[in-house]
């Protein structure tokens, strides 16, 4: 940056190089150039010469004043007009930043996405600070009293292997930058209560032609959690409102759910699950489309990158999806 140049004098900022956005600031430039009594001192912001609010303080020093400074970052430098010098002589430069102190982090949430091997902790950081803000996540075992700290600039993934202090923990987040520091409330967690099951995925749909046509949705998860509650939502693509069906699910086999739908309409389906009685949901699965036939039975299938999900049954149309065992996204 601009701060790496060789200086013939110095430049400083009051109240500080990093300051609260909207403040009035003064930038001072003091020349120390051999054999030069500066005729004039100039200020540049991001390479553009400033014309106003410059005050000469003495023979070697000048001040540039800004009212209500709102730029997150700026590169400042100053120059001198020396007698007998054709060009301006560079005095010094400095990068300045404006922003806000951090808000109190809230909505601290920790979940373990099944198969990830990590506990993922997130929080609402509040308003944008514009300046470098670091977060320290504190994880304290309620059984051993041992505390671990993790430094991050956003969320944190903590290996479950490093959580050796039993099952119960307190988690809180400290936010800090050059303008201030705040601390969240403490969140109490039990590792067994924060697991989000492996992604539930809709793999296939078929409509069976009967007196009342019936659509069967095939869906599955490779979770090892035995008691899982799921929701499947569906709607005609032309509708705004979702219909929701609830299931107590046992993923020891691929699930088949029956729907009685209107003929010749394109529907969209999504599914999500949670460990029964627990707080956190999976994100909704990717959209799965199925058009009901007028009369002829129809099968819709997803061909997954993981062959596990190929059923070997005849399909009328193929759409591609991707199965991961590591669910990420909204946790509801």
């Amino acid at each position: 940056g601009i701060t790496n140049i060789n200086c013939s004098g110095h430049i400083w900022v009051e109240p500080a190089t990093i300051f609260k956005m909207g403040m009035n600031i003064s930038i001072y430039c003091q020349a120390a150039i051999k054999n030069c009594q500066p005729r004039k001192l100039h200020f540049y912001k991001n390479g553009i010469k400033e014309r106003f609010q410059i005050t000469r303080i003495n023979k070697t020093t000048a001040r540039l004043w800004y009212k209500n400074f709102l730029e997150p970052h700026a590169s400042m430098y100053c120059t001198a007009e020396c007698p007998k010098h054709f060009q301006e002589t560079l005095i010094c430069g400095k990068d300045i930043s404006s922003g806000y102190p951090p808000d109190i982090p809230d909505e601290v949430t920790c979940v373990i996405y099944e198969y990830s091997g990590n506990m993922t902790c997130t929080w609402n950081a509040g308003k944008l600070t514009y300046i470098d803000t670091k977060y320290v996540v504190h994880v304290k075992s309620l059984e051993t009293e041992e505390e671990q700290q993790y430094l991050t600039s956003s969320y944190i993934n903590i290996s479950t292997d490093s959580l050796q202090g039993g099952k119960k923990y307190l988690v809180w987040v400290q936010a800090a930058n050059a303008l201030g520091m705040e601390e969240s409330k403490q969140l109490q967690i039990h590792l067994d209560d924060i697991v989000i099951p492996s992604a539930a995925v809709i793999s296939r749909a078929e409509t069976i032609n009967a007196t009342v046509p019936k659509t069967i949705i095939y869906w599955d998860s490779q979770t090892t959690i035995e008691k899982v509650s799921c929701e499947m939502r569906y709607k005609a693509t032309t509708n705004q409102t979702w219909n929701v069906k609830e299931f107590d699910t046992n993923f020891t086999y691929v699930q088949q759910s029956e729907f009685y739908l209107e003929p010749n309409i394109k529907y969209v389906f999504q599914v999500r699950c949670q460990e029964t009685g627990k707080r956190y949901w999976q994100p909704w699965s990717s959209l799965f489309f199925h058009k009901t036939p007028e009369t002829v039975p129809q099968v819709t299938s997803k061909a997954f990158q993981h062959d596990t999900w190929n059923s070997g049954l005849t399909v009328a149309s193929i759409s591609t999806g991707h199965l991961t065992s590591d669910n990420r996204g909204d946790i509801g």
Epitope: E114, Y115, S116, G117, T160, D161, L191, D192, S198, D220, S221, Q222, T223, T224, E226, N250, F251, T252, Y253, V254, Q256, T308, S311, G312, L313, S325
Partner: antibody, heavy 118, light 107 residues
């Protein structure tokens, strides 16, 4: 690539305890899945014995529960079978496996053959 | 406990033929049945789970069907390398149980 490898004695005397080790490479046993022991008797009959979940919880076959223990050493990425008071009826090839969710056994070790004899 | 019965100990077939093996559960297991192939000196290898879902990398000549208590495993066109013992297993509930196996012999 996930690999499982069983190890243990070839021969155990009746009434003694049997200890077998399954060493897993390519996946951490604490990151997920159920990790099982299955045995195959000389006549080829397969018997499920029990499993340990990634969280450390266990589930045993009712017929073996009184003398079976499955444990693990997470630092070595190993899980273990201990079968007490063995008899000649426990002569078998012992496999460790990883289950596909709550469904079938997707990864198997090569098996270790155990003979119970005095 | 659920008992899985494979009524045929042996099945004889020719290369290129279609062959079907059956398995019966002593009680309802929905579609929670897997099929394995075992060759001499090797561990069982997963082919089908949840009655009809082929496992990763399994050739599509292997198919499965059935639900409830009756299940069928079919090899659409038998190859010489398919000579093996085939086991069914219920993964509906613990204790998990296996069938006694059907040995596929090539004529």
């Amino acid at each position: 690539d996930v690999q499982l490898q069983e190890s243990g004695p070839d021969l155990v005397k009746p009434s003694q305890s049997l200890s077998l080790t399954c060493t897993v490479t390519g996946y951490s046993i604490t990151s997920g899945y159920n990790w099982h022991w299955i045995r195959q008797f000389p006549g080829n009959k397969l018997e499920w014995m029990g499993y340990i979940h990634s969280s450390g919880t266990t589930n045993y076959s009712p017929s073996l529960r009184s003398r079976l223990s499955i444990t693990r050493d997470t630092s070595k990425n190993q899980f273990f079978l201990q079968l007490n008071s063995v008899t000649t009826e426990d002569t078998a090839t012992y496999y460790c496996t990883r289950q596909l969710g709550l469904k079938a056994m997707e990864y198997w070790g090569q098996g270790t053959t155990l003979t119970v004899s005095s | 406990d659920i008992v899985m019965t494979q009524s045929h100990k042996f099945m004889s077939t020719s290369v290129g033929d279609r062959v079907s093996l059956t398995c019966k559960a002593s009680q309802e297991v929905r579609t929670a049945v897997a099929w394995y192939q075992q060759k001499p000196g090797q561990p069982p290898k997963l082919l089908i789970y949840s009655a009809s879902y082929r496992y990763t990398g399994v050739p599509d000549r292997f198919t499965g069907s059935g639900s409830g208590t009756d299940f069928t495993f079919t090899i659409i066109s038998v190859q010489a390398e398919d000579l093996a013992v085939y086991y069914c297993q219920q993964h509906y509930t613990t204790p998990y149980s296996f069938g006694s196996g059907t040995k596929l012999e090539i004529k």
